[in-house]
């Protein structure tokens, strides 16, 4: 439905888990206007270019990663930073822009042997920051109090995508984060064009699956900017095109 499309985020647009910190910008927008009221929080406007606070990469946009703006900085002041393009230095996969991964400290192009699920669940070190706590929010490598013999299935509560089974990601739904299916080719996805659009929705979509990217649907090019429909589409390389 249009409603669910308008209220769906990409997985990497989670609000910061500030554990009750007042007035953070990651407030929810009503799925049905006039029904949902995020208490005590100001809505964040689309034109707000303030740095977006974060605790982990999943809270940032698809073209961003979470880190301190200065090397060795305090974990408490981490923000979402622009991803690094090919051949730029990196310390972990999330630092590299979509379609790339971190190999030997350099962002290189992803190939068929590197699936996003593997990428997300491997190296997660940061710039020497201590991620143990952030404003009282308990940071865990797995969901504490739960003995996970199997990874989370669809609808299971999660903290990050590595808590979920293969083919699923951890995305916000209502007031929880749950395992949802990674998007397939042709499915509607959400592309955030502006930094200020973070954390606005409470219904989030996963990212597009391996080999896919979130692009404007061809027959929607004429639509207004605010209503452009994005779908998961096969990668098209600039240097050569395959015609079938």
């Amino acid at each position: 439905t249009l409603n669910s499309v308008l209220n769906s985020n990409a997985i990497k647009n989670l609000p910061p888990p500030l554990g009750g910190a007042a007035g953070h910008p990651g407030s929810a927008v009503s799925a049905a206007p006039g029904i949902l009221y995020p208490g005590g929080n100001k809505y964040q406007t689309i034109d707000n270019y303030q740095p977006y606070p974060c605790a982990e990469d999943e809270e940032c946009g698809t073209d961003e990663y979470c880190a301190s703006p200065t090397r060795g900085g305090d974990a408490g002041v981490q923000i979402c930073l622009a991803c690094r393009k090919r051949r730029k230095r990196c310390m972990r996969h999330a630092m590299c822009c979509p379609g790339n991964y971190c190999k030997n400290g350099i962002c290189v192009s992803s190939d068929q042997n590197h699936f996003r699920g593997e990428i997300e669940e491997t190296i997660t070190e940061s710039f020497g920051n201590d991620h143990s706590t952030l404003d009282g929010y308990s940071r865990r490598t797995t969901l504490s109090s739960k003995m996970y013999h199997t990874k989370g299935q669809e609808g299971s509560v999660c903290l990050r995508s590595s808590d979920c089974a293969s083919g699923l990601c951890c995305a916000r739904h209502f007031w929880s984060k749950i395992c949802k299916p990674v998007l397939k080719e042709g499915q509607v996805c959400t592309k955030h064009r502006r930094k200020g659009s973070h954390g606005l929705e409470i219904f989030q979509r996963c990212y597009c699956g391996e080999g896919l990217s979130c692009r404007i649907q061809k027959d929607h090019h004429q639509a207004s900017n605010s209503s452009r429909l994005h779908t998961c589409q096969r990668h098209h390389h600039h240097h050569h095109h395959h015609h079938h």
Epitope: T1, N3, P16, G20, N41, Y137, S144, V157, F174, P181
Partner: antibody, heavy 117, light 111 residues
């Protein structure tokens, strides 16, 4: 074992106030969403309020501006401050958490609120 | 908001019989590849208990005789063989949209 225990219910006059509490144990309280759901006598269930693990709060139109949900993670406690109470707020109030999945998967035993003159 | 209609209002059956409860939503509760439909059981004087979430997944500690099915707007809770402790009121609930809403309930009583 996840346990939720509500308290604070009672008889209150229309226009009055009441504060409900829910004591949680058996899980990392601060990390999970928790909600209030009520049930009027002989009626069905109605969602009242929720608070996420990151502290955002949510209400339906029926209680917006009158009820306030809050949590004290240090005390593993959830609260519902109810002001400007009406007769139609009479119900058993349950706290429920979304612990293993997105649904209301663990519930307390409930506390009864009666609004009557 | 999404309105859920349960039928029948009352189901009179004997222990050992199969119970089939229906829940119809005013609009689809499917999204993100998940059917956001849940089922709860409530006995007199007790809190509800989650039986099924995501249309067909069993909650923790729920006996295998309880199963859920359906997608879109039509959902079914099936109790394969009624036990004496299964006589109760059953509610469906959607979590696709805010506010989360509940059906009016189906009472399963002893015939």
């Amino acid at each position: 074992e996840v346990q939720l225990v509500e308290s604070g219910g009672g008889l209150v006059q229309p226009g009055g106030s009441l504060r409900l509490s829910c004591a949680a144990s058996g899980f990392t309280f601060s990390s999970y969403a928790i909600s209030w759901v009520r049930q009027a006598p002989g009626k069905g269930l109605e969602w009242v309020a929720s608070v996420s693990g990151w502290g955002d709060t949510y209400y339906p139109d029926s209680v917006k501006g009158r009820f306030t949900i809050s949590r004290d993670n240090a005390k593993n406690s959830l609260y519902l401050q109810m002001n400007s109470l009406r007769a139609e707020d009479t119900a058993v109030y349950y706290c429920a958490t979304s612990y293993e999945n997105y649904a209301f998967d663990y519930w307390g035993q409930g506390t009864t609120v009666t609004v009557s003159s | 908001e999404i309105v859920l209609t349960q039928s029948p209002a009352t189901l009179s059956l004997s222990p050992g019989e199969r119970a089939t409860l229906s829940c119809r939503a005013s609009e689809s509760v499917d999204d993100f590849g998940i059917s956001f439909m849940n089922w709860y059981q409530q006995k007199p004087g007790q809190a509800p208990r989650l039986l099924i979430y995501a249309a067909s997944k069993q909650g923790s500690g729920i006996p295998a005789r309880f199963s859920g099915s359906g997608s879109g707007t039509d959902f079914t809770l099936t109790i394969s063989s009624l036990e004496p402790e299964d006589f109760a009121v059953y509610y469906c609930q959607q979590s696709k949209e805010v506010p989360p809403t509940f059906g009016g309930g189906t009472k399963v009583e002893i015939k």
